[in-house]
């Protein structure tokens, strides 16, 4: 094995094309120089190597950079991505906005793994907080990113970047998440008028209070049952059933079939028989 | 040579679970990626999972993602394929097929075994 | 997702004739195309690779080509061991995704 360790003549790379899926596991580690590959990293992606040369071309670079890559380096790496760990990701300084993009890339249409995961979060701590443009690009390649973070952590999100928030990047957000968001939102969508206001605040409806559900039932914004399924019990709690008619507008009817669940059983089993009787829907508290 | 060999497939209920595995021999298991390719009586191949020659990275099509769990023991030369709440559309038979690097094609092809999902 | 469309999905020929399986991608994927060949009961078999590789130990009547999101399989001289089903497959760092196949029958 020990005169393995030398690149026999004439294999010594001079650069990185096809001719190295040829080259044994030893031979890649003896005659790829290392600066080499760094420089030309963008070309490994259209070389088909093998999963154990990649693992060669990985220790190269391990070896060049112990104190891990340069952003030059992480920005063209593609698939080679893939087989770093969290432990290797910690290490990088990754700041742009570019590179971030073309890692994600590499992943996108998968669940978020845990060097993706890493890599977001070495990035939003090198930057201090979410910004539009982060959160832009996070949750269109992950969805439910938002979701994902804990309140402590939403809540370095500046209320501007609230505006890159589509209703599907909520879906699963639990109450205490939306509790953090709402207020955001609500500074984010105040010069809207009424109508355009509640299409945006919608999706945060989940963390609204009473009184603010009380100021959207005079503005005849007809909400529909999905959107009052997930208001917070306490919030809808106090609300009268002139209120809620309002709120829902031609939705009110949809109260019925939702009887049995909350919030509405709560809210129900809080009214006057005689007041839930005006709305004619059978509703017995 | 290279051999891949799948068993466990048969008939099972809706709703529940089942566990392929497929043997390998004549190459070094260790290095290669391992997918699961299925195919529905009558109809086309389809591309179920693959999982990277480590076993840290494991990728799944849509229809089966949150149900079936790839995974690999390199020390028995074995890939496995957990499937859990099984519906009748999963109803195939299943190959599982070697691939060499990220870019290689499928190069290697077990039997298959067929799995029947019904009530 | 990538999807990949194959046409014809059925092909009537005769041994000794030229036939054409064309393949297109939803996007491009440069050279990263297979082609299988797979017998009724059988596993399928791997005939092209990077579009136009012929995988050891296939006759060389079999060729591919293109690039991009438009490739084709040829068969140049039909034989009677040839009467199969063929797919098409793009292939890349993490997912496969398969033609819907194309049936050569004896016409």
């Known amino acids: 094995e020990v005169e393995k360790t030398a690149c026999p003549s004439g294999k010594k790379a001079r650069e990185i094309d096809e001719s190295l899926i040829f080259y044994k596991k030893w031979e890649l580690e003896a005659c790829v120089d290392a600066a080499l590959l760094a420089t030309q990293m963008d070309r490994v992606n259209a070389i088909p190597f093998t999963y154990e040369q990649l693992d060669v071309l990985k220790h190269k670079l391990d070896e060049l950079y112990p104190q891990g890559y340069p952003e030059s380096v992480i920005q063209h790496l593609g698939y080679l991505f893939l087989k770093m760990s969290p432990e290797d990701i910690r290490k990088w300084n990754v700041t742009s906005l570019e590179t971030l993009k073309a890692l994600l890339e590499v992943n996108k249409g998968h669940e978020m793994s845990p060097q993706v995961a890493t890599l977001i979060d070495r990035f939003v701590k090198g930057r201090g907080q979410l910004d539009k443009d982060t959160l832009d690009t996070l949750t269109a390649f992950y969805p439910g990113y938002l979701c994902s973070l804990s309140p402590e952590e939403l809540s370095s999100v500046p209320p501007s970047s609230i505006w890159a928030v589509r209703p599907q990047d909520l879906d699963t957000c639990d109450p205490r998440q939306l509790d953090v968001l709402y207020p955001k939102a609500r500074l984010a969508f105040q010069n809207m008028n009424g109508s355009e206001y509640f299409v945006k605040i919608q999706s945060f409806l989940g963390g609204a209070p009473t009184e603010d559900l009380k100021a959207l039932s005079q503005q005849n914004v007809s909400m529909d049952l999905a959107t009052f399924m997930k208001l917070r019990t306490d919030a809808v709690l106090p609300l009268t059933v002139a209120e809620v008619q309002k709120l829902l507008g031609p939705h009110v009817e949809g109260l019925k079939a939702e009887e049995r669940h909350r919030p509405v059983r709560d809210w129900i089993l809080r009214q006057r028989q005689d007041d839930l009787d005006t709305l004619g829907l059978g509703l017995q508290g | 040579q290279v051999q891949l060999v799948e068993s466990g497939g048969g008939v099972v209920q809706p709703g529940r679970s089942l566990r392929l595995s497929c043997a390998a021999s004549?190459?070094?298991?260790?290095?290669?990626?391992m997918n699961w390719v299925r195919q529905a009586p009558g109809k086309g191949l389809e591309w179920v999972a693959v999982?990277?020659?480590?076993?840290?990275?494991?990728y799944y099509a849509d229809s089966v993602k949150g149900r079936f769990t790839i995974s690999r023991d390199n020390s028995k030369n074995t890939l496995y394929l957990q499937m859990n709440s099984l519906r009748a559309e999963d109803t195939a038979v299943y190959y599982c097929?070697?691939?060499?690097?990220?870019?290689?094609?499928?190069?290697?092809w077990g039997q298959g075994t067929l799995v029947t999902v019904s009530s | 997702d990538i999807q990949m469309t194959q046409s014809p999905s059925t092909l009537s020929a005769s041994v000794g004739d030229r036939v054409t399986i064309t393949c297109r991608a939803s996007q491009s994927i440069s050279r990263w195309l297979a082609w299988y060949q797979q017998k009724p009961g059988k596993a399928p078999k791997l005939l092209i690779y990077?579009?136009?590789s012929l995988e050891s130990g296939v006759p060389s009547r079999f060729s591919g080509s293109g690039s991009g999101t438009e490739f084709t399989l040829t068969i140049s001289n039909l034989q009677p061991d040839d009467f199969a089903t063929f797919y098409c497959q793009q292939y890349n760092a993490y997912s496969r995704t398969f033609g819907q196949g194309t049936k050569v029958e004896i016409k």
């Open positions: 004549g190459f070094t298991f260790s290095s290669d990626a």
């Open positions: 999982i990277w020659n480590e076993g840290s990275n494991k």
């Open positions: 990077k579009a136009s």
């Open positions: 097929a070697r691939d060499r690097g990220p870019l290689w094609p499928l190069d290697y």
